[in-house]
Amino acid sequence: MNSFNYTTPDYGHYDDKDTLDLNTPVDKTSNTLRVPDILALVIFAVVFLVGVLGNALVVWVTAFEAKRTINAIWFLNLAVADFLSCLALPILFTSIVQHHHWPFGGAACSILPSLILLNMYASILLLATISADRFLLVFKPIWCQNFRGAGLAWIACAVAWGLALLLTIPSFLYRVVREEYFPPKVLCGVDYSHDKRRERAVAIVRLVLGFLWPLLTLTICYTFILLRTWSRRATRSTKTLKVVVAVVASFFIFWLPYQVTGIMMSFLEPSSPTFLLLNKLDSLCVSFAYINCCINPIIYVVAGQGFQGRLRKSLPSLLRNVLTEESVVRESKSFTRSTVDTMAQKTQAV
């Protein structure tokens, strides 16, 4: 019924300079993508390739060990969160290529863009759980010897996933498709209609629960851990610090643009120039956040090479050593052998 070529629009239009002469058609619908969108497409493509392959490999390596190895449980869940988010990328990629036209329907609009938010919350909650685990290993080694088991780890992961789903619901509910009259285009986005306060509330909750609060707690948590481990001669290592900083910092660095633009847009009028500028950068911010979905496997490999000192080791074997090594629960050594586990703090969100 609607036989439009969305990739190469060809529509006459009234001059947007608000001239009084509406008799002159102006074809200003550009066939070329904006620079931020092109950058977003490049990032999406790289993230998809690395994220799908890397996380699939991590899932494969950790799945066999997840029944008995707690670290494997953490990494398995993080990889699943990332892998799920990467599956939405071809759809988002296609939409940007078609000038943000969304031909996939209302259900896909609600579900697919929400995956990256689910990933954000799942990852940060899993990171919080992993951080708590690392903290307990250092400060409560006896408790860990008695109670730290695979069953409890799975329960903690289930709670993290449940909370993540709960926190994703508002964005899921407010996602709608809007079909524009001219040029003909179906857009997928959030619509709060008149309720600007609700929009702000969602943005603030996302910023606090998905960014600021985790930033604060992880910073405090790892400050204590590092202070304790540095006080022991055997574990004093700049490499440990670098890994911890890389893992935690990357999560917050890649989420920062999305969170900042999101909060700003919720306080701006949709017709304001700043809002329109930020809206043009939206895809780029999302793609930047999506880097979180592929960076964990990269960190694991880099760290694995560093700690194993075997650059020629096969990738699955290298990952297995990094991801499934069980922490030794002796206070003086608790951080030494499980340093790489802290990479689980690196999480992805949107």
């Epitope: 529509y11 943000h100 524009e180 009259y181 001219f182 003909p184 949709p270 017709s271 809206n279």
Partner: antibody, heavy 116, light 112 residues
């Protein structure tokens, strides 16, 4: 100047079909949508849909998708609307109007009366 | 569909008075381009509607400057600074941001 000249009034029986025309002049016919609007007696305006002569794109309001069929003849710069299976509720004035933005130019309207 | 709610439905005025018609949409009318496609039409008895104001506040060619439009997002207003005899008729607001294009129920401007 832009002109939209519509065909004359129609008196039809329930269940029949009617086809009305809208001859456009004074602008490049293929550059703009041709929209159609219904106005029942003493009531507001209802958008039926548009036809885009440039690429044959057509869009109907959900309410009219089984009632109206929009076509154009580019060679004569004329737009057509056919209404099917007419009922008494279809009695109204039907306007063609140049679209793609605000409806800046309208035809004079075609009165359709459905009567047994 | 976007519902356009016009108030009042009838507006009795005296010639020379100022008149104000309100139009509220059920959703934001801001287009992805940043434009707001809210327009005002006047229909006199036995005539086709005529475009007065397009994109919230722009007067169409030939429309006197006593007509002005304002608003943003979901709330819009048409003002006539000094009502003249030729201004009497039914005023419709309309949005062409989203499909389907929708119109308000109309406001009849009549003499007291």
């Amino acid at each position: 100047q832009v002109q939209l000249q519509q065909s004359g009034p129609e008196l039809v029986k329930p269940g029949e079909s009617v086809k009305m025309s809208c001859k456009a002049s004074g602008y490049t016919f293929t550059d703009y949508y041709m929209d159609w609007v219904k106005q029942s007696h003493g009531k507001s305006l209802e958008w039926i849909g548009y036809f885009y002569p440039n690429n044959g794109g057509v869009k109907y309001s959900q309410k009219f998708k089984d009632k109206a069929a929009l076509t154009v003849d580019k060679s004569s710069t004329t737009a057509y609307m056919e209404l099917h299976s007419l009922t008494f509720e279809d009695s109204a004035v039907y306007y063609c109007t140049r679209g793609s933005g605000p409806f800046a130019y309208w035809g004079q309207g075609t009165l359709v009366t459905v009567s047994a | 569909d976007i519902v356009m709610t016009q108030t009042p439905l009838s507006l009795p005025v005296s010639l020379g008075d100022q008149a104000s018609i309100s139009c509220r949409s059920s959703q934001s009318l801001v287009h992805s381009s940043g434009n707001t496609y809210l327009h005002w039409y006047l229909q006199k008895p036995g005539q086709s509607p005529k475009l007065l104001i397009y994109k919230v506040s722009n007067r169409f060619s030939g429309v006197p400057d006593r007509f002005s439009g304002s608003g943003s997002g979901t709330d819009f207003t048409l003002r006539i600074s000094r009502v003249a005899a030729e201004d009497l008729g039914v005023y419709f607001c309309s949005q062409s941001t989203l499909v389907p294009v929708t119109f308000g129920a109309g406001t009849e401007l009549e003499l007291k």
